[in-house]
């Protein structure tokens, strides 16, 4: 297994719908066909994985149908979009990254991005 | 909150081995720097080997180098230290520690570790 640098911003506003967006960018050493991205969530001294998508080079990124992310891919770039966020699920947004094909493995982390997500106040009441 | 709890010590014979097992109690050691120390009667608590949270980076004092070896075993949340060509100085408390680090540590052991467990008696003697 050999390491790999992954870049990723520091800090992400989720909108008032609860969205998030961020790249995730990777320094490919060699000429990878398969590809997977897994989106960890720190918080609480305790990681878990938010979601994950395994693609193919040139092909659109795939995650399973209950998934709260999307997300496409460009060359070395991988665009990710989390939904369905609240107050409750700021926390740090790790990137992972593994090169699984061709050989060798390689293995990226970010250092995270800390997605903030702030409830909306509701509407108050109206005559109109 | 986690807890770690050891299991596997005993007493064994010099040259035989043991395997020590570091477990997370409410929640996972997934990405953790996990450590293994030991104390001996009147000896300092001394660190014998770590683990990184990727499980990519392992470290182990000298004293136990070739003879043990540490590894990640995601599927049942735990840390394995496995022993071998026990001598009589290996005798002690053994301690599992662990930190979760800062990702861009995550290939890294921890220099420092805010849980510790209970501990878990080895004794190697004829």
């Known amino acids: 297994c050999k390491a790999m640098h992954v870049a990723q911003p520091a800090v992400v506003l989720a909108s008032s719908r609860g969205i998030a967006s961020f790249v995730c960018e990777y320094a490919s050493p060699g000429k990878a066909t398969e590809v997977r991205v897994t989106v960890l969530r720190q918080a609480d001294s305790q990681v878990t994985e938010v979601c994950a998508a395994t693609y193919m080079m040139g092909n659109e990124l795939t995650f399973l149908d209950d998934s709260i992310c999307t997300g496409t891919s460009s060359g070395n770039q991988v665009n990710l979009t989390i939904q369905g966020l609240r107050a409750m699920d700021t926390g740090l947004y790790i990137c992972k990254v593994e090169l699984m094909y061709p050989p060798p493995y390689y293995l990226g982390i970010g250092n995270g991005t800390q997605i903030y997500v702030i409830d909306p106040e509701p509407c108050p009441d109206s005559d109109f | 909150q986690v807890q770690l709890v050891e299991s596997g010590g005993g007493l064994v014979q010099p040259g035989g081995s043991l395997r020590l097992s570091c477990e997370a109690s409410?929640?996972?050691?997934?990405?953790?720097?996990i450590g293994w120390f030991r104390q001996a009667p009147g000896k300092e608590r001394e660190e014998v080997s770590c683990?990184?949270?990727?499980?990519?980076?392992?470290n182990y004092a000298d004293s136990v180098k070739g003879r043990f070896t540490v590894s990640r075993d995601n599927s049942r949340n735990s840390v394995i230290l496995q022993m071998n060509s026990l001598k009589p100085e290996d005798t002690g408390v053994y301690y599992c520690?662990?930190?979760?680090?800062?990702?861009?540590?995550?290939?890294?052991?921890?220099?420092?570790?805010?849980?510790w467990g209970q501990g878990t008696q080895v004794t190697v003697s004829s």
């Open positions: 520690t662990g930190k979760l680090l800062h990702p861009s540590l995550w290939s890294a052991c921890a220099n420092e570790y805010d849980l």
């Open positions: 409410g929640g996972t050691l997934d990405y953790w720097s």
């Open positions: 683990i990184s949270g990727t499980g990519l980076r392992t």
